[in-house]
Interface confidence: medium
């Protein structure tokens, strides 16, 4: 008996069906398979969990989180013994092993490994102004997503004709920051942060509108 | 694997109307930022119109040439982008691509492109 | 209307270095991009934001953009970078992007 190489992993958007690829070739009827999927969660590396098994010609469940999400993706018994994961959750993030057993057949390799990553869009960023919005002030804008794997990225536009920031500012895409160093007059206006990664972008709006002095009345 | 697949191409006649979907699948299509480009046959590439997701306001912009004649619209619940053509004009005979703007908002490149649909407009 | 020039061709031999041009109005005060287009084949987006590369593009490919004119640099050029490349300036709140003619590069 021999399981098939199984690509590394599979990336799946939380929410979305993944299918685990497990195939082998054997020399026996299948007439006693038997099929066990496991998964070392990436949140609980200690704990292995059974996510399905095939014996004796029956499915049986594995733990309780994967009820009524998880199947076969064919008719069983076969040689093709890939599962399906309906409504990818975050924890479903892990290592998943397909053990196969095909009596009499024994020796060769009987293990299958995949590893599973559930990815999930930036949530709304928040978009806040820090400092003073005074004349000559130096400001930072902030944007920041709560939920993004894999980590989102975060880029700053200004709404206006050219999209590009004044040439007194940084950005930093990884903290999602832009320092604006002597604002001006010229530094007003609309800001937009665009929080993405593999799977999505999510935006926020700001508006920076810098304040003059007001003359002083003699 | 983030993907888009077009279809709905086809030959019409002038004056005719076409709608053209675009299937969304690898990404979570609602948050996207969606975009039609078209290319006549050899000749190089003209952006269509986009549509806003509905968080962003779901507003659409338009070429001129196509401006009152299509419209641009998305469900996100079947992950799927449309382009409805009317008043069709020789002119509009091209391939017909569905892309996601990717790596920022408006100054963010398009990033996949769909496989291309063929409308051609012919009497 | 905004235009955007590109020359029609350019040539280079393999392992050198191929620079495509993009010129417009005060280009560099907006964003470029770069479209790979091989015969038969949906355009590939190669530079985005004046500079960027999105995953998966070479590192022989960078770009560059300031004045009237942004620039798509192909470094050790090989037989497979042949196609068809369009530049294209980012448009704005209220207006769509502009693509170049398209230049085809030719690897000798």
């Known amino acids: 008996l021999e399981v098939s190489e199984s690509p590394g992993s599979v990336q799946v958007a939380r929410g979305q069906t993944a299918v685990l690829p497990c195939a082998f070739s054997t020399s026996a009827a299948l007439l006693n398979l038997n099929v066990i999927w496991m998964v070392i969660p990436l949140s609980n590396a200690n704990q292995p969990e059974q996510v399905i098994l095939y014996q004796g010609g029956q499915m049986f469940d594995g733990a309780l989180r994967f009820h009524g999400r998880v199947g076969f993706t064919g008719t069983m018994p076969a040689t093709n013994v890939s599962i399906f994961i309906n409504n990818t959750q975050l924890s479903d993030t892990g290592t998943y092993q397909c053990l196969v057993n095909n009596l009499p057949d024994r020796g060769g390799r009987n293990i299958g490994v995949t590893g599973l990553t559930v990815l999930v869009p930036p949530s709304a960023p928040q978009c806040q102004i820090q400092g003073s919005q005074d004349l000559g002030s130096d400001v930072i804008l902030l944007c920041s997503s709560e939920e993004g794997i894999p980590r989102p990225t975060y880029l700053w536009e200004k709404l206006d004709n050219t999209l590009k920031l004044p040439p007194t500012a940084t950005q930093d895409q990884v903290q999602g920051t832009v320092t604006i160093r002597n604002i001006s007059a010229l530094s007003s206006g609309l800001y937009q942060c665009v929080a993405s990664n593999a799977i999505g972008t999510s935006t926020c709006l700001l508006d920076l509108q810098v304040i003059s002095p007001q003359p002083r009345s003699v | 694997e983030v993907q888009l697949v077009e279809s709905g191409g086809g030959l019409v006649k002038p004056g005719g109307s076409l709608r053209l979907s675009c299937a969304a699948s690898?990404?979570?299509?609602?948050?996207?930022?969606m975009s039609w480009v078209r290319q006549a046959p050899g000749k190089g590439l003209e952006w269509v119109g986009r549509?806003?997701?509905?968080?962003?306001?779901?507003?659409?912009d338009y070429a001129a040439p196509v401006k009152g004649r299509f419209t641009i619209s998305r469900d996100d619940s079947k992950n799927t982008l449309y382009l409805q053509m009317n008043s069709l004009k020789t002119e509009d005979t091209a391939v017909y691509y569905c892309?996601?703007?990717?790596?920022?908002?408006?100054?963010?490149?398009?990033?996949?492109w769909g496989q291309g649909t063929l409308v051609t407009v012919s009497s | 209307s905004y235009e955007l020039t590109q020359p029609p061709s350019v040539s280079v031999s393999p392992g050198q270095t191929a620079s495509i041009t993009c010129s417009g109005d005060?280009?560099?005060?907006?964003?470029a991009s770069w479209y790979q287009q091989k015969p038969g084949q949906s355009p590939v987006l190669v530079i985005y934001?004046?500079?960027k590369r999105p995953s998966g593009i070479p590192e022989r490919f960078s770009g560059s953009n300031s004045g009237n004119t942004a620039t798509l640099t192909i470094s050790g050029t090989q037989a497979e970078d042949e196609a068809d490349y369009y530049c294209?300036?980012?448009?704005?709140?209220?207006?769509?992007?502009?693509f170049g003619g398209g230049t085809k590069l030719t690897v000798l």
């Open positions: 934001q004046d500079s």
């Open positions: 892309a996601r703007v990717a790596h920022g908002g408006y100054s963010g490149g398009l990033d996949p």
């Open positions: 690898g990404f979570t299509f609602s948050n996207a930022w």
């Open positions: 294209s300036s980012t448009g704005t709140a209220h207006t769509l992007a502009v």
């Open positions: 005060k280009l560099g005060d907006k964003y």
């Open positions: 549509i806003k997701s509905k968080t962003d306001g779901g507003t659409t």
